[in-house]
Interface confidence: low
Amino acid sequence: CRTSECCFQDPPYPDADSGSASGPRDLRCYRISSDRYECSWQYEGPTAGVSHFLRCCLSSGRCCYFAAGSATRLQFSDQAGVSVLYTVTLWVESWARNQTEKSPEVTLQLYNSVKYEPPLGDIKVSKLAGQLRMEWETPDNQVGAEVQFRHRTPSSPWKLGDCGPQDDDTESCLCPLEMNVAQEFQLRRRQLGSQGSSWSKWSSPVCVPPENPPQPQVRFSVEQLGQDGRRRLTLKEQPTQLELPEGCQGLAPGTEVTYRLQLHMLSCPCKAKATRTLHLGKMPYLSGAAYNVAVISSNQFGPGLNQTWHIPADTHTEPVALNISVGTNGTTMYWPARAQSMTYCIEWQPVGQDGGLATCSLTAPQDPDPAGMATYSWSRESGAMGQEKCYYITIFASAHPEKLTLWSTVLSTYHFGGNASAAGTPHHVSVKNHSLDSVSVDWAPSLLSTCPGVLKEYVVRCRDEDSKQVSEHPVQPTETQVTLSGLRAGVAYTVQVRADTAWLRGVWSQPQRFSIEVQVSD
């Protein structure tokens, strides 16, 4: 017989199956091109001196063999004498150590037994009712398949699963979805309903993130407010990287976790846009305002839990940067302008009250006046800062007010609202003899002293009712007592105290009359 043909003679060894545990198994036969076929098998046991014969019986009952020698794979053409269009039965007989070992038989129609491809190209992954659904386009001319998957996590070996029979242009598989770990999947296919058809190779890895993206474990720090009124938000700790199974390490398409930074500027609520979402890699500059910052992790299945921080407002104040003039028509603030065409946000809130009670006003874009100042005015009727109490004022500026990350702090300071001159008048002025020619004048702290940096000084005025001479004594804003000396006994004096701010002279307290009694010697 020719080696390329199936030999229709008795094989050159006795026909007896030893029934041993070793021997040929897993015979697979399939068409590999339009006119060529291949059969392959496994051999278990010592391979030295083993000869393999591929046996074939036609539907007519005639049988033949191919001698494969020591090889466990054999190719033949459709001209080899084996009927490829009709059903044939194939098995392998291995002659070893003077005995014959037989494989289980496979019965198939060779022409229709095709070597299947694994899923090729894109495998679309989605989540369906808590399970993973994979979908792909059936390879050309390969409709009708049995599909298996195998999957592993970073800490577990491969586990096998079954996708069931498929008979459409699109194939799909439902697989387990892990809550908190990434998985690597591979798929393989074989011809449906064809006994002895062999499995395809495994597909390329499909990398699937956990159902829940990892919670971002990051820490932020905020730098000091710079000269430009901005401070950098920096990431102290990078988000933990998702541990990946072996085949997903490197590029790992599909397991990407994206971290987004969501900024919410709490100050200046009257601005157009309060929140902004950024890539975590792009750490923004912030104004001195208060912010809530959230880091949101998401993967292809959607967002996960977020981590939220509060960044408190920078409370460093500039006591002299703001000028306030109060006129009959209303109040005007002046401060050093930042640049041309700036929008300013002026925010104020009563000191000691919840930050949620802040009020603000947005100016139209304005250029500096000839003195380089920016201004904001309001009328008494508007009620702005109209109550006689201490307000904390912050002014923010931006050339692009619609961009949350481009605001800067111009200044923060305190202001006493309403009629500060009158409201600040010191009360409970009392005079006590100190010595033969001096007295001690005390008063209760002015309301202005509750407003840091607002009270510039107290002035104590002493008037000699005889000579009408007046003397004035400046007193540090932290003091509420002064000693008046050089006084004459028996003379009537009046004393008054006022509290001054940097821009306003206070109103004198009610005159307090006193005199030093004449000491009579015995």
Epitope: G121, D122, K124, W136, E137, R260, R276, T277, L278, H279, G281, K282, P284, T405
Partner: antibody, heavy 118, light 109 residues
Framework: QVQLVQSGAEVKKPGASVRVSCKAS????????IHWVRQAPGQGLEWMGI????????SYAQKFQGRVTMTRDTSTTTVYMELSSLRSEDTAVYYC???????????WGQGTMVTVSS | SSELTQDPAVSVALGQTVRITCQGD??????AGWYQQKPGQAPVLVIY???NRPSGIPDRFSGSSSEDTASLTITGAQAEDEADYYC???????????FGGGTKLTVLG
Amino acid sequence: QVQLVQSGAEVKKPGASVRVSCKASGYTFTSYYIHWVRQAPGQGLEWMGIINPSGGSTSYAQKFQGRVTMTRDTSTTTVYMELSSLRSEDTAVYYCAKSNWAYAFDIWGQGTMVTVSS
Amino acid sequence: SSELTQDPAVSVALGQTVRITCQGDSLSSYYAGWYQQKPGQAPVLVIYGKNNRPSGIPDRFSGSSSEDTASLTITGAQAEDEADYYCNSRDSSDNHLVFGGGTKLTVLG
């Protein structure tokens, strides 16, 4: 291989409509968005709109709202773009493009020249 | 809706490094895509995502981004790199997309 093949050049009168086709092959048609982008002679690229071939949902640039319609036929893996009430400034090369996960256009059609002239 | 701003023209000496920039509000939230277009041809994607190059794009092309600016860098520019370069990004306000006006790159010498 992955490709988008567009229909041929068109000459139209002002006020008329034009329909340009874009046939996709070499990938899972329903898995990726298709966009339409145009380029007037000597000008830059201008995004017109997007269609999701899976469900057919669309979103159009403000400028083309009311004049553009994008449709798809999953049986032939073809996307269509129809622009109505044509004016001379609609003279341009019209491209279809497939976008990847990053909304970047990784595959482009060869372009269809549409000339609007009276 | 967002706008992306590019320099209209940039030139570079053969073999030198050139940086083309794209500025816009949406780039604070989304990465840019970069496209090369030669006369009479459809655009070709050269960079997308953080700094991803499609297969077939030489590694002299790279991308980077900062606050609201994306950059395309060509290290060792070649004569065949002379072309128009466009950036694009998702609009920060909706799922629409927007292109920059384009930069004409001239390679000298």
